[in-house]
């Protein structure tokens, strides 16, 4: 019998408010046995896949997606899904990336550390098999 797949979670390092030109890494997390993680923009037609998946703990796998130099076009909501053959999971909650001008003024908001969106219930949508170009400026990475 096929197992029920837990929903993934998504977080951003160093946070979700990123100065223009700085880097951000989205971290997708899921269960043991994930083969592919996908980071999606608000429209599912723009996404990036990685098969570079590591087991972070005995119960949790992860993949990392890095944007080296954030631009205004990178702002917006992101979410993760994963493929554990033969099924795709549901999506994580959205995580909103905010890009701020590097004015350096005293009222500039600090980068929010460790922002994340964990699993909460939302309707299932399993139509994840369309193929589309990877998001500009996104690349998959794995860091140790």
């Amino acid at each position: 019998q096929e197992e029920d797949l837990p929903r993934p979670s998504i977080s951003a390092e160093p946070g979700t408010v990123i100065p223009l030109g700085s880097h951000v890494t989205f971290v997708c997390r899921g269960p043991v046995g994930v083969q592919t993680f996908r980071l999606e923009r608000e429209s599912r037609s723009t996404y990036n896949d990685t098969e570079d998946v590591s087991q972070a703990s005995p119960s949790e796998s992860e993949a990392r997606f890095r944007i080296d130099s954030v631009s205004e076009g990178n702002a917006g909501p992101y979410r993760c899904i994963y493929y554990k053959p033969p099924k795709w999971s549901e999506q994580s909650d959205y995580l909103e990336l905010l890009v701020k001008e590097t004015s350096g003024g005293p009222d500039s908001p600090d980068t929010e550390p460790g922002s994340s969106a964990g699993p909460t219930q939302r309707p299932s949508d399993n139509s994840h098999n369309e193929h589309a170009p990877a998001s500009q400026g996104l690349k998959a990475e794995h860091l140790y």
Epitope: V32, G33, V34, Q35, T36, D49, E51, D52, V53, S54, Q55, A56, S57, P58, S59, S61, K84, P85, P86, A140, E141, H142, L143, Y144
Partner: antibody, heavy 116, light 110 residues
Framework: EQSVEESGGRLVTPGTPLTLTCTAS????????MCWVRQAPGKGLEWIGL?????STAYASWANGRFTISRTSTTVDLKITSPTSEDTATYFC????????????WGPGTLVTISS | ELVLTQTPASVSEPVGGTVTIKCQAS??????LAWYQQKPGQPPKQLIY???NLASGVPSRFKGSGSGTEFTLTISDLECADAASYYC????????????FGGGTEVEIK
């Protein structure tokens, strides 16, 4: 019942390229990453390489250039490009179970003997 | 290049005893570790995945532990059927490095 099976092992002379084939039953092989592992007589397991579902490959450093892994929609192949006597071994194909799980569904192996 | 060093190379223990096998990685591999049992003429059989998870059908006498670079397989209440070779595997085959197998430990039951 899910299973994998290797074929193509035989006696060949040194320098003669040899291709081994892995087939699957009970699951769709193209959905999975697949590993090749070998074991020389009386020795331990040696990981050769892996082909991902996307067709990208990863090899052990010692295996780079000596082996080529490829796949079709129904099979995964291991080519020994220029065999030497040190390549005499049982060659195993295994399905990669995903992160943390590794190569967990193994075939029975196929014996390759390199001798003049 | 990642190296997995398994110790001891061989061990002999009586029925009912306990065997501890260590696997040391040359760099941190987080929880990307599995353990296998292999008997002569057979392919390896997975015992443990992701450091400490028991594979389907494997008795709870087999226990995996560790993290980072140091990992352990403990077999308690040894039975004659446990006589075999045991291997650790780093299960990460990504962009940072590729895994592989330890050198193996032969377990003899007295």
């Amino acid at each position: 019942e899910q299973s994998v099976e290797e074929s193509g092992g035989r006696l060949v002379t040194p320098g003669t390229p040899l291709t081994l084939t892995c087939t699957a039953s009970g699951f769709t092989i193209s959905d999975y990453h697949m590993c090749w592992v070998r074991q020389a007589p009386g020795k331990g397991l040696e990981w050769i390489g892996l082909i991902r579902a996307s067709h990208s490959t990863a090899y052990a450093s010692w295996a780079n250039g000596r082996f080529t892994i490829s796949r079709t929609s129904t099979t995964v192949d291991l080519k020994i490009t220029s065999p030497t006597s040190e390549d005499t071994a049982t060659y195993f194909c295994a399905r990669y179970g995903g992160s943390g799980i590794g190569c967990n569904l193994w075939g029975p192996g196929t014996l390759v003997t390199i001798s003049s | 290049e990642l190296v997995l060093t398994q110790t001891p190379a061989s061990v002999s223990e009586p029925v009912g005893g306990t065997v501890t096998i260590k696997c040391q990685a040359s760099q941190s591999i987080d929880s990307n570790l599995a353990w296998y049992q292999q008997k002569p003429g057979q392919p390896p059989k997975q015992l443990i995945y992701a450091v400490s998870n028991l594979a389907s059908g494997v008795p709870s006498r087999f226990k995996g532990s560790g993290s980072g670079t140091e990992f352990t397989l403990t077999i308690s209440d040894l039975e004659c059927a446990d006589a075999a070779s045991y291997y650790c595997e780093c299960t990460y085959y990504g962009n940072s490095y590729v895994g592989g197998f330890g050198g193996g430990t032969e377990v003899e039951i007295k």
